[in-house]
């Protein structure tokens, strides 16, 4: 009896016949920015308040006729699926409605602008607890509106939009493609990516994670008692915002950095499609569909990673791409990542006194994507270690030499265009993890952080044969902090995190000779805090 | 279970069907209704779950709405036409779920005829 | 909308023998929640199948439901007179709007 949805999201645990996870987001207030609702609908009534902000275009054509069930239709729904008695997902979660959207789901960036700062002074007269916003909407990319998401977000709201129904990168479209937003695509019961007639979700790095948006349970505004199946990553990003009201419902204190992470980590993943994406966005698509927490205390002793994409750099050859992680976060390793393989590596560097990730083209490249590894690490001290080319047979080699400091992550970069062609592989020495070690004419940046337990070490995958991809994982109760190649596979088009797992990708293996160069070898630094676990111990 | 209130109804007459049970509680069980045209297969028109959630068949458009109280379950024909002359079933499902599963108890029926 | 399309009528079966009908959906069928019905003239259908391959309560085995995601079958073994009747399938995808019958199939027993 329970809607595939709302058991999708569900981890075993929960799953009896009926949805009825502890605590229902009773500590949250949601803002529902969407079209008109049908507030005494019997699934939400006296759980959302119609607020008296509306602001919305005319609808178009001279003939249209407003009929109120069709003006309510979407809102309605989307209030079911955050909080409804029945079909929804934080059943206890209180929300408020904004109307931004007129009869024929229309609206305009000007009254979504007037809509979050009608939030931001109500949060200021009268502040409660923790907020959620849904933006259950998508327009082309913004500018300010991606700026006013921003603000919101940096004054301590969780802002969860639609990634976007076009089948089209989500960068492209607006709130979606704001870095603060938690941005939600949509997948079905076969956990497929949603096909919605000759379009479907959008996708991308600008994507955070999946959720169930196709034929979503949701009170319908026919009738007080109706419901229906509607579709869309509005129904996904309704999902996500009643999951995040759970979660800080549990952990009120939680920021959005800390949200975002754990909605990634409990995330299920690996289990869409990708071949449904458009091939070049593939990599740059989160695959996980959300769920919520198994529970809903006790996760803060992980440490918690992400992986964050660059735009593409595009193909000039001094083009480059930079990777930032958010506010909260610690950039801990950097990579680099090219579909033609020409780059000239990735650096972290310091910009507005917060680290990034920069990757660089090539001459005749196509392009490079830089990758940063974001993570929280409470009371960290991280800094960049660089050593220049060494121009000496056995390579250039950094290391963490502070006291207490730990090897995160390392990077490379070089200034000719093709390092490590007919050069040999250069091995690290054995018994020597804390330091990094690359070509001699590449200059190489060692990552080192200090924190309060925090442990690392490295780990290795080395293929002898040449191929496509090469993975290395760390096992479970370490965190995947840094992914890189060992220097000497030029073929290496670049390093990337995926979850808990270090990928090096090659060129196409039929166009690599199986020479000594077609060794590949996967290096992935795990981490874990000692001091976090002993933490969360404390407080149970 | 058993249906009741099936009659000859003029076209536009808005007409409700009672189906009143007995032995069980509808406060565990999920009731469709679903309807036999003369001489033709069966057709699911909808349902009202133990909760008093309603859905129904997309082709349906707002032409019937579902109602129950403690022992009866009513569907209301809100604006008859003659291609709505049928038997009409109402079933007991033991799921009380959200998609049809275990239809397991069903009424005699209550013949419907709309014609001018 | 899921479409369910039956065998078509009439399949003849011998007292004794086996009869097969088959159900095939549009869409997947949700959690393989596809029921199987029998009908005589005059009275309101008896349920004897559901999930599938799941017997009702009463129902002789001699009844078997099988298949998943969009193809099922019935197949009724060592046939008696008074299995002659018009059968249904009824199932749904995971739109609640989209549960429906199959066009029915009747079996005439010789």
């Known amino acids: 009896s329970i809607p595939w949805n709302l058991e999708r999201i569900t981890p075993p645990r929960y799953r009896a016949d009926e949805y009825q996870p502890p605590d229902g987001g009773s500590l949250v207030e949601v803002y529902l920015l969407d079209t008109s609702i049908q507030s005494d609908h019997r699934e939400i009534e006296g759980r959302v308040m119609v607020t008296d902000f509306e602001n919305v275009p005319e609808e178009d054509g001279t003939r249209f006729h407003r009929q109120a069930s069709k003006c309510d239709s979407h809102g309605t729904h989307l209030a079911g699926v955050v909080s409804g008695r029945d079909a929804g997902v934080a059943k206890g979660a209180s929300m408020r409605s904004l109307r931004v959207l007129n009869c024929q789901g229309k609206g305009t960036v000007s009254g979504t602008l007037i809509g979050l700062e009608f939030i931001r002074k109500s949060q200021l007269v009268q502040p409660v607890g923790p907020l959620v916003v849904l933006l259950p909407l998508a327009g082309g990319y913004s500018r300010v509106l991606n700026a006013a998401c921003q603000r919101l977000a940096r004054a301590g709201v969780v802002l969860v939009t639609a990634a976007g129904n076009f089948r089209d990168d989500a960068c492209l479209y607006s709130p979606a493609s704001a870095p603060e937003v938690i941005t939600v695509g949509a997948t079905n019961a076969q956990d497929q990516p949603v096909t919605l007639g000759t379009l479907g979700t959008n996708f991308g790095r600008c994507v955070d994670l999946f959720a169930p948006g196709e034929d979503i349970i949701g009170a319908s505004s026919d009738c007080s008692t109706c419901f229906v199946s509607q579709s869309g990553t509005s129904q996904a990003a309704a999902h996500v915002a009643g999951i995040a009201a759970m979660m800080l419902s549990a952990e009120p204190e939680l920021t959005l950095a800390e949200l975002r992470q754990r909605l990634i980590h409990f995330s299920a993943k690996d289990v869409i499609n990708e071949a449904w994406f458009p091939e070049d966005q593939r990599v740059l698509t989160p695959n996980l569909v959300a769920a919520l927490p198994p529970s809903t205390h006790g996760a803060g002793w992980q440490l918690f990673c992400r992986t964050v994409w660059s735009a593409h750099s595009g193909p000039t050859r001094m083009a480059t791409a930079v990777a930032r992680c958010a506010p909260d976060e610690e950039l801990l390793s950097c990579s680099s990542f090219s579909r033609s393989g020409k780059r000239r590596g990735e650096r972290m560097e310091a910009q507005g006194g917060k680290l990034v990730c920069r990757a660089h083209n090539a001459f005749g490249g196509e392009g490079v994507y830089a990758i940063a590894r974001c993570c929280l690490l409470p009371q960290a001290n991280c800094s960049v270690h660089t050593a220049p080319p060494a121009e000496a047979s056995m390579g250039t080699r950094v290391h963490c030499h502070q006291q207490g400091h730990v090897l995160t992550g390392c990077s490379s970069h070089w200034e000719v265009e093709d390092l490590g062609t007919h050069k040999p592989p250069v091995l690290r020495p054995r018994g020597q993890p804390n330091q990094c070690v690359g070509h001699r004419e590449a200059s190489i940046h060692a990552s080192c952080c200090h924190a309060p337990g925090l442990e690392c070490k490295v780990k290795e995958h080395g293929i002898p044969a040449p191929q496509e991809q090469v993975t290395v994982a760390c096992e479970e109760g370490w965190t995947l902090t840094g992914c890189s190649a060992l220097p000497g596979t030029s073929h290496v088009l670049g390093a990337y995190a995926v979850d808990n797992t270090c990928v090096v990708r090659s060129r196409d293996v039929s166009t690599t000779g199986s020479t000594s160069e077609g060794a590949v070898t996967a290096v992935a630094i795990c981490c874990r805090s000692r001091h976090l676990a002993q933490a969360s111990q404390e407080l149970q | 279970v058993e249906e009741s209130g099936g009659r000859l109804v003029t076209p536009g007459t808005p007409l409700t069907l009672t189906c009143t049970v007995s032995?069980?509680?509808?406060?565990?069980?999920?009731m469709n209704w679903v309807r036999q045209a003369p001489g033709k297969g069966l057709e699911w028109i909808g349902a009202?779950?133990?909760?008093?959630a309603t859905f129904f068949a997309s082709w349906v458009n707002g032409r019937f709405t579902i109602s129950k109280t403690s022992t009866t379950v009513d569907l209301k024909i809100t604006s008859p036409t003659p291609e709505d002359t049928a038997t009409y079933f109402c079933?007991?499902?033991?799921?009380?779920?959200?998609?049809?599963?275990?239809?397991?108890?069903w009424g005699p029926g209550t013949l419907v005829t709309v014609s001018s | 909308a899921a479409v369910l399309t039956q065998t078509p009528s009439p399949v003849s079966a011998a007292v004794g023998g086996t009869v097969s009908i088959s159900c095939q959906s549009s869409k997947s069928v949700y959690s393989n929640y596809l029921s199987w019905f029998q009908q005589k003239p005059g009275q309101p259908p008896k349920f004897l199948i559901y999930?599938?391959?799941t017997l009702a309560s009463g129902v002789p085995s001699r009844f078997k439901g099988s298949g998943s995601g969009t193809q099922f079958t019935l197949t009724i073994s060592d046939v008696q007179c008074d299995d002659a009747a018009t059968y249904y399938c009824?199932?749904?995808?995971?739109?609640?709007?989209?549960?429906?019958f199959g066009g029915g199939t009747e079996v005439v027993v010789k």
């Open positions: 009824a199932g749904g995808d995971t739109n609640i709007s989209d549960n429906a």
């Open positions: 999930k599938a391959s």
């Open positions: 032995g069980f509680s509808l406060s565990s069980y999920a």
């Open positions: 079933a007991r499902d033991t799921n009380d779920g959200w998609y049809i599963n275990r239809l397991d108890l």
């Open positions: 009202i779950r133990s909760s008093g």
